[in-house]
């Protein structure tokens, strides 16, 4: 025998109190699949969380973070404070990157400058707290007898901190 509740579409629930009639989800609740016996309570975006997408009867609300914060975790389960470029977030708040490291984003950690000499190249542009060094041609390429100059290698693509 087919379960009568299987006929209830998303956005409704199978109401046992009313002879298994498909009743609409009440306000602030949803069912994203058919055949549900209850509707789930919608997520509330409170405090540092901000509503990005309101709950509908078939889909949960989605939150993001208020200005000055960014999302972390699956489905933006946490909001983490932004820092300025050239800083990283520590337990004591935002701290400047130490000499020899940089951060070109408002999130994530300070990372060491690229070591140009490991690739046999010279430093074309010095690094800062906000920017990586730019490596230039190798010293051999700059010798008087060299007929051409190889284009500078692109700066290393910065990694992204986990979302």
């Amino acid at each position: 025998l087919q379960d009568p509740c299987s006929n209830c579409p998303a956005g409704t629930f199978c109401d046992n109190n009313r002879n298994q009639i498909c009743s609409p989800c009440p306000p602030n609740s949803f069912s994203s699949a058919g055949g549900q016996r209850t509707c789930d309570i919608c997520r509330q975006c409170k405090g540092v969380f901000r509503t990005r997408k309101e709950c509908s009867s078939t889909s949960n609300a989605e939150c993001d973070c208020t200005p000055g914060f960014h999302c972390l975790g699956a489905g933006c389960s946490m909001c983490e404070q932004d820092c300025k470029q050239g800083q990283e977030l520590t337990k004591k708040g935002c701290k400047d990157c130490c000499f020899g490291t940089f951060n070109d984003q408002k999130r994530g950690i300070c990372r060491p400058w690229t070591n140009c000499s490991l690739d046999g190249k010279s430093v074309l542009v010095n690094g800062t707290k906000e920017r990586d060094v730019v490596c230039g041609p190798s010293p051999a390429d700059l010798s008087p007898g060299a007929s051409s100059v190889t284009p500078p290698a692109p700066a290393r693509e910065p990694g992204h901190s986990p979302q």
Partner: antibody
């Protein structure tokens, strides 16, 4: 910034129908409910119904089920309310307002006058 | 439908005074109540959501309290711009309903 733009006034004859508009801007139209609220002169607010532009979910106040039809045009980020078989009792200010539960942004309202 | 009763219909106060508005629901609605004010010829504006949660951009003199069936909106020191109509609204069940409103007027 979030804005809901409504025409200032509509004049229609008894028995006719009218389609009121509410153009949304400053946010993702498909992510937030649009509600419609009626207010007769000197009277309280009366909730007509709402629509979720992302999937056309609607909820209606039973008093307006045969009177009002809510639709949206996603391409222009505009919500509409069609009112049929108009009588003098339908003369009122009609507001559109954004929100799933609490209504956080409101249009300026359209004054509908039903008169011969 | 859930009936919201607001009392009194009219409140007369002087600027600087504290004032409280009452909203009573016909059944238990938890904290699913929201408060608005509406100035003459203006649109309603959300003041408090979910009984007590503040709204960005709304002055801190507005506060809300209550749960179940009895709710209160308070203004701790009324300013001239606060003289308006005040409405409560429930979002506990369809259809959403509004209270009949309380008019705040200058004494």
């Amino acid at each position: 910034q979030v804005q809901l733009q409504q025409p200032g006034a509509e004049l229609v004859k008894p028995g006719a129908s009218v389609k009121l508009s509410c153009k949304a801007s400053g946010y993702t139209f498909t992510n937030f409910w649009i509600n419609w609220v009626k207010q007769r002169p000197g009277q309280a607010l009366e909730w007509i119904g709402n629509i979720y532009p992302g999937n056309d979910n609607t909820n209606y106040n039973g008093n307006f089920k045969t009177k009002a039809t809510l639709t949206v045009d996603r391409s222009s980020s505009t919500a509409y309310m069609h009112l049929s078989s108009l009588t003098s009792k339908d003369s009122a200010v009609y507001y559109c307002a954004r929100g799933q539960l609490g209504l956080d942004y409101w249009g300026q309202g359209t004054t509908l006058t039903v008169s011969s | 439908d859930i009936l919201l009763t607001q009392s009194p219909a009219i409140l007369s106060v002087s600027p600087g005074e504290r004032v409280s508005f009452s909203c009573r629901a016909s059944q238990n609605i938890g904290t699913t109540i929201h408060w608005y004010h509406q100035r003459t010829n203006g649109s309603p504006r959300l003041l408090i959501k979910f009984a007590s949660e503040s709204i960005s951009g709304i002055p801190s003199r507005f506060s809300g309290s209550g749960s179940g069936t009895d709710f209160t909106l308070s203004i701790n020191s009324v300013e001239s711009e606060d003289f308006a109509d005040y409405y409560c609204q429930q979002s506990n069940s369809w259809p959403f309903t509004f209270g009949s409103g309380t008019k705040l007027e200058i004494k």
